[in-house]
């Protein structure tokens, strides 16, 4: 991807960019491309939107191939129509404590975040808002059709759920880490971010990791068993190599992905871990990137894009990262 060779652009004409996205020259000054936006993957050839004060943060010098579009130090955040200064903490609602850092918002839930799966004593759990209370609570609905309960019970099991780490105090530092944000892509390779001060200087910093909730090419609905409405964590038949901007993971992974439902529910990562993955690029360069690996998924009706910004935020978090 070096810029010393002659400029040659794709055969098709310059792309039409979505509203609000700048058409810019790539990092070599060669071709017109749609600028990458905050939190998106960027490269020398795929630059970030300069009109929004974004730059491509490559992280450690060893990884100068692929970065994440990041706001310049001190960039404010716009959240729910309000502008917050970098470093400012605010309670976006009674449910969330948020922090703005260089254009990115990280939020910590103030309510419990467990995802409750059916169990023998509560086969139909449902979250409800109780009068006078901020946080929703779980209630157990009676089944509409008693006959369903009997034979199906053997399949129920309690799922371990992990909330945020309890607040830690270390050497005069109140350690706080927001949950990982939802993956920026519903399929294919995306980015997940969080804000933490869990470092030697107790300074807030943004962390990012690659994530893949499911491959785009997988036709998961075909795998749903007859009579079922969901496939929560489909089995991937063979180990796969991850691809990232033309670079390929050096190892193969038997990764877990989240499935799909046919009844309007969405399946999202429930428990995850973060592991380093080494990618080898066509020019022989090797780069190491942190990546989310799914342990379990949960299927629920609180799907991203619901009307309540906080509800969709709440359920689009990755709970219980073990890293």
């Amino acid at each position: 991807q070096n810029c010393s060779g002659p400029c040659r652009c794709p055969d098709e004409p310059a792309p039409r960019c979505p509203a609000g996205v700048s058409l810019v020259l790539d990092g070599c000054g060669c071709c017109r491309v749609c600028a990458k936006q905050l939190g998106e993957l960027c490269t020398e050839r795929d630059p970030c939107d300069p009109h929004k004060g974004l730059f491509c943060d490559f992280g450690s010098p060893a990884n100068r191939k692929i970065g994440v579009c990041t706001a310049k130090d001190g960039a404010p955040c716009i959240f729910g129509g309000t502008v917050y200064r970098s470093g400012e903490s605010f309670q976006s609602s009674c449910k969330y404590q948020c922090t703005c850092l260089d254009g990115a918002v990280g939020c910590m839930p103030l309510c419990s975040m467990d995802v409750r799966l059916p169990s023998p004593d509560c086969p139909f759990p449902r979250r409800v808002k109780l009068p006078g209370k901020c946080c929703e609570e779980w209630v157990c609905d009676e089944p509409k059709d008693q006959t369903v309960v009997g034979p199906a019970l053997a399949a129920y099991r309690l799922e371990d759920t992990f909330g945020p780490d309890p607040t830690m105090i270390r050497a005069n530092c109140l350690v706080q880490t927001t949950e990982w944000s939802a993956c920026s892509k519903t399929c294919g390779m995306g980015i997940s971010t969080r804000v933490t001060n869990d470092n030697a200087s107790c300074r807030l910093e943004k962390q990012s990791r690659l994530c893949m909730v499911r491959p785009c090419e997988a036709d998961l609905e075909e795998n749903i068993k007859k009579g079922k409405k969901c496939i929560r964590t489909p089995k991937i038949s063979k180990p796969i190599k991850f691809e990232l901007s033309g670079c390929t993971s050096m190892k193969t992974y038997r990764a877990k992905f989240c499935g799909v439902c046919t009844d309007g529910r969405c399946c999202t990562p429930h428990r995850t871990t973060t592991l380093p993955v080494e990618f080898k690029c066509p020019d022989g360069e090797v780069m190491k990137k942190n990546m989310m690996f799914i342990k379990t998924c949960a299927c629920h009706y609180n799907c991203p894009g619901d009307n309540d910004i906080f509800e969709s935020l709440y359920y689009r978090k990755m709970y219980g990262d073990m890293a």
Partner: antibody, heavy 119, light 112 residues
Amino acid sequence: EVQLVESGGGLVQPGGSLRLSCAASGFTFSDYYMAWVRQAPGKGLEWVANINYEGSRTDLLASLKSRFTISRDNAKNSVYLQMNSLRAEDTAVYYCARDTSRGSYFDVWGAGTTVTVSS
Amino acid sequence: DIVMTQTPLSLSVSLGDQASISCKSSQSIVHYNGNTYLEWYLQKPGQSPQLLIYKVSSRASGVPDRFSGSGSGTDFTLKISRVEAEDLGVYYCFQGSHFPLTFGQGTKLEIK
């Protein structure tokens, strides 16, 4: 009709300067790279320089970099070649050409302007 | 620099016959994006050059189908299946994959 018209050529003494101009018409000028190619008398073609859509990137023949500069003015649909410290070996017909920047290079050529460097 | 060597330097062909011009590059001319930017230009007497073939084998718009390009790596060929009177002139191959961009020395096509 797509057209490129060069001007600014002429007789100049060694060490002198010339500025060649190329006026483009019949196409959206800012959607194309532009280039200069020269041809010495009785000789073959030689690429001189090209310039990207907005003039932020220019590439020149290494041996000419210190003396020649390519630039463009999209408002005037024009591309320029500033030639300084001219030498006898710079004597040639200078062609302005449109560079598609995609599949092909020089899909439209001007008629050329003659530069003669002689004392 | 990549040297483009054309053979023959001159060619005399009867009308209706086939003509073939070879162009060899001193090294591979595959661009870093994977494409090979090998082009052929014709300069008719007293005129500016005109594009015939780009990316080894793609015909430029308005170019008759009797012109065809082929080749890969370092060896490329321009063929004119049935030479017509208007085809006379000097043919140049050109590589645009590496700096400096370079032309072959030219092949003069004459009609017998």
